[in-house]
């Protein structure tokens, strides 16, 4: 069967469906969680919802085969399988790999190091969020975009404050944290 990938944010309502139309006049349709845990089965004009962690928060649309899941959580991460038993006795299968991610929290910017080096100001900042697999991007007056949780830069003497923004993102959300630096090698945060 075909495999489709889906990434959604935790707490949202999700529709698992296939991009093609169902076989005509199919006999039975089943949705599985992790290949062997039946969630729901349709046949003879009725849907049967089985005892599972999804009971009460799933609904099947027999027309399209779509499975609606409300309030998905990270524990719902899995490969979901839709199996259709056709009128001719053949089975067809579709797989959807669902990844549920929490929205990223607002990052905290920590000053790891700040010191005068030959009249310049050496600055080392880290962008911290608790145990998440995320992407980091620093923005500000930088020679190039930095995609790392740590920013290291050396500033020449200047009169104005400079701000650096760390953006943390995963495939479902992003949040920013900003650090503003004023000479002489001292800081204020916003």
């Amino acid at each position: 069967g075909r495999l489709v990938h889906m990434t959604v944010v935790s707490g949202s309502n999700v529709t698992l469906n296939i991009s093609e139309s169902l076989p005509e006049n199919y006999k039975q349709l089943t949705w599985f969680y992790t290949f062997d845990q039946k969630i729901v089965e349709w046949d003879s004009g009725k849907s049967k919802y089985f005892e599972s962690k999804f009971k009460g928060r799933v609904r099947l649309d027999p027309q399209s085969g779509a499975l609606y899941i409300s309030k998905v959580q990270k524990e719902d991460n899995s490969t979901y399988v839709m199996r259709v038993l056709k009128k001719d006795g053949y089975e067809q299968e579709w797989k959807i790999k669902l990844q549920v991610l929490d929205p990223v929290p607002k990052p905290v910017i920590k000053i790891e190091k700040r010191e005068d080096v030959d009249d310049n100001c050496y600055l080392k900042l880290s962008c911290v969020i608790p145990g998440e697999s995320v992407n980091y991007t620093w923005y500000g007056e930088l020679p190039k975009e930095i995609q790392n949780s740590v920013l290291e830069t050396t500033l020449k003497p200047h009169k104005h404050s400079r701000c650096y923004t760390c953006q943390v993102s995963n495939s479902v959300s992003s949040k920013n944290g900003t650090f503003c630096f004023s000479p002489p090698c001292t800081a204020a945060r916003s």
Epitope: K27, Q28, T30, D36, Q37, K38, E41, D43, S44, K48, F50, E51, S52, L85, K87, D88, G89, Y90, E91
Partner: antibody, heavy 121, light 107 residues
């Protein structure tokens, strides 16, 4: 892993009844149907009937109509097959088999180990 | 009732051989056919359903084909553990019926 464990061998007198059990484990019992199949000594396989563990719906082979009763107990994940008015030609090994669907598709994916029922006076 | 007829009723073959068993239905059953394997004193084991779909865990040397009334089970390269009796079964309509079995013996 999926297992269907059947009750032990039985010896019955002609005219008596026998009740064979099939205890399921390793899956959600109500999500699949159970068929009963028997095999007389040295003979082939004969389908007796099917029951939905979801709602108790049944379909029996005409040959056994009125003589067989299939039931399930969802609290213990057990299917039962009772055969009445036993005759010597009912001597056979009785198997339960899990259907791939909760309604009958006729495709069996797991079988119990079998229960030998001997009918003898 | 739909009659299922298997041929041959027994066949002798050697390890490594390719073996084909055929099954004929008395009426069109589309692809509603299953194959099972049974060893002496043991329960049947599901091999193939929907005429050609392999049950989970069944070695790929087993394959099924056909539709309508004529079906075949092929074992591409016989292994010692394949010597057993094979049954076809129609799942098209109640009552489900089985073929009489084909006994595969060591030559």
């Amino acid at each position: 892993q999926v297992q269907l464990v059947q009750s032990g061998a039985e010896v019955k007198k002609p005219g008596a009844a026998v009740k064979v059990s099939c205890k399921a484990s390793g899956y959600t019992f109500t999500a699949y149907g159970i068929s009963w199949v028997r095999q007389a000594p040295g003979q082939g396989l004969e389908w007796m009937g099917w029951i939905s563990a979801y709602d108790g719906d049944t379909n029996n082979a005409q040959k056994f109509q009125g003589r067989v009763t299939m039931t399930t107990d969802t609290s213990s994940s057990t299917a039962y097959m009772e055969l009445r008015s036993l005759g010597s030609d009912d001597t056979a090994v009785y198997y339960c088999a899990r259907d791939r669907y909760s309604s009958s598709s006729g495709y069996f994916d797991y079988w119990g180990q079998g229960t030998l029922v001997t009918v003898s006076s | 009732d739909i009659q299922m007829t298997q041929s041959p009723s027994s066949v002798s073959a050697s390890v490594g051989d390719r073996v084909t068993i055929t099954c004929r239905a008395s009426q069109d059953i589309s692809s509603w056919l299953a194959w099972s394997q049974q060893k002496p004193g043991k329960a049947p084991k599901a091999l193939i359903y929907a005429a050609s779909s392999l049950q989970s865990g069944v070695p790929s040397r087993f394959s099924g084909s056909g539709s309508g009334t004529d079906f075949t089970l092929t074992i591409s390269s016989l292994q010692p553990e394949d010597f057993a009796t094979y049954y076809c079964q129609q799942a098209n309509s109640f009552p489900y019926t089985f073929g009489q079995g084909t006994k595969l013996e060591i030559k």
